[in-house]
């Protein structure tokens, strides 16, 4: 999947638009809004009916380094009485980011841009019934 | 910067840490995974906090479609199908890396963005506290 | 694709055993739950046995001491030792499989118990 280039007619290329060799992009990692924060309600992984853990993933050869996936605890949703009841299910909720992977060939080193799967957390749902044949 | 194990054979020149500015190949690798989220799963209906999603588009920014959830209600809905607020819906929230078109409208100069998406909501129990 | 196979259904004399079994191929999850339910001519299906991620395991009263759920993770498949069989046993047992968001249930396998 590639990049879609500025296809509206009333962007114009700039002038100022760097040089950048054929089938690669350049581009600058300095992250914009690096140190924006989550204002999520607090602690919703433990309070949450449909509670999860979270695991963090360590590679040097990505950027960023480290990425958190969330594990729901369990089958089931936790009841008003605390206990797990599994006529209702827990289930992950993803949302793909982007990240860079650095691959060595050799002594040479490139660039890639990879789409990354993650877990955020769980909800509970009513499951789907399936009858197999 | 991130240190990276070095193949002790290479000339020492390389840098440990990722460079600032990156050249990339314009291929993203991995996965057709499915960028709609209403198409990949029905979750945000059959959930007891359940959300709506909002299409956000920006031609400026890669990808250019990004879907953000909003919780339908403030409790969670009972196994009545009626809703319940003695339980809140809340959003889960995620720090996401997009890229910015850098300088503006140049189709191929890109810089990351963080940027702060709801992903969609779970239903907790809410912090009680006693105002004095 | 899920398919369950059941087996282990047939017809047996009051007091006597029978083990059903049914294996789940397709889907594997890290968290998921097996049993069975069953269904008397007439009446609701209702829970017979579960076991929950190989573990925490869930009875009706009417069959506690003389029904045993066990599972086999590695084949994906659960057992049901079932002793001392009575004629209020007899129902078609329906195979449950439970991953995250999907529940999935067999054709059923007859149990049939003479006095």
């Known amino acids: 999947r590639k990049i879609p280039k500025v296809g509206h007619t009333f962007f114009q290329k700039p002038e100022s638009c760097p040089p950048v060799p054929g089938g690669s992009m350049k581009l600058d990692i300095g992250i914009i809004n690096e140190n924006q924060r989550v204002s999520m309600s607090r602690n919703i992984e433990s309070r949450s009916t449909s509670p999860w853990n979270y695991t963090v993933t360590w590679d040097p050869n990505r950027y960023p380094s480290e990425v958190v996936q969330a594990q729901c605890r369990n089958l089931g949703c936790i009841n008003a009485q605390g206990k797990e009841d599994i006529s209702m299910n827990s289930v992950p909720i993803q949302q793909e980011t982007l990240v860079v992977r650095r691959k060595h060939q050799g002594c040479s080193v490139s660039f890639q841009l990879e789409k990354v799967l993650v877990t955020v957390g769980c909800t509970c749902v009513t499951p789907v019934i399936h009858h197999v044949q | 910067g991130i240190t990276i194990p070095r193949n002790p054979g290479c000339p020492n020149s390389e840098d440990k840490n990722f460079p600032r500015t990156v050249m990339v190949n314009l291929n993203i690798h991995n996965r057709n995974t499915n960028t709609n989220p209403k198409r990949s799963s029905d979750y945000y209906n059959r959930s007891t906090s359940p959300w709506n999603l909002h299409r956000n588009e920006d031609p400026e920014r890669y990808p250019s479609v990004i879907w953000e959830a909003k919780c339908r209600h403030l409790g969670c809905i009972n196994a009545d199908g009626n809703v319940d607020y003695h339980m809140n819906s809340v959003p889960i929230q995620q720090e996401i890396l997009v890229l910015r078109r850098e300088p503006p409208h140049c189709p191929n100069s890109f810089r990351l963005e963080k940027i702060l998406v709801s992903v969609g909501c779970t239903c907790v129990t809410p912090i009680v506290h006693h105002v004095a | 694709e899920v398919q369950l196979v059941e087996s282990g259904g047939g017809l047996v004399q009051a007091g006597g055993s029978l083990r059903l079994s049914c294996a789940a191929s397709g889907v594997i999850f890290r968290l998921n739950a097996m049993g069975w339910y069953r269904a008397a001519p007439g009446k609701q299906r209702e829970l017979v046995a579960i076991?929950?991620?190989?573990?925490?395991?869930n009875y009706a009263d009417s069959v506690k001491g003389r029904f045993t759920i066990s599972r086999d993770s590695a084949k994906n498949a659960v057992y049901l030792q079932m002793n001392s069989l009575k004629p209020e046993d007899t129902a078609v047992y329906y195979c449950?499989?439970?991953?995250?968001?999907?529940?999935?249930w067999g054709q059923g396998t007859q149990v049939t118990v003479s006095s």
């Open positions: 449950y499989y439970n991953i995250p968001g999907d529940v999935y």
């Open positions: 076991i929950v991620n190989g573990g925490s395991t």
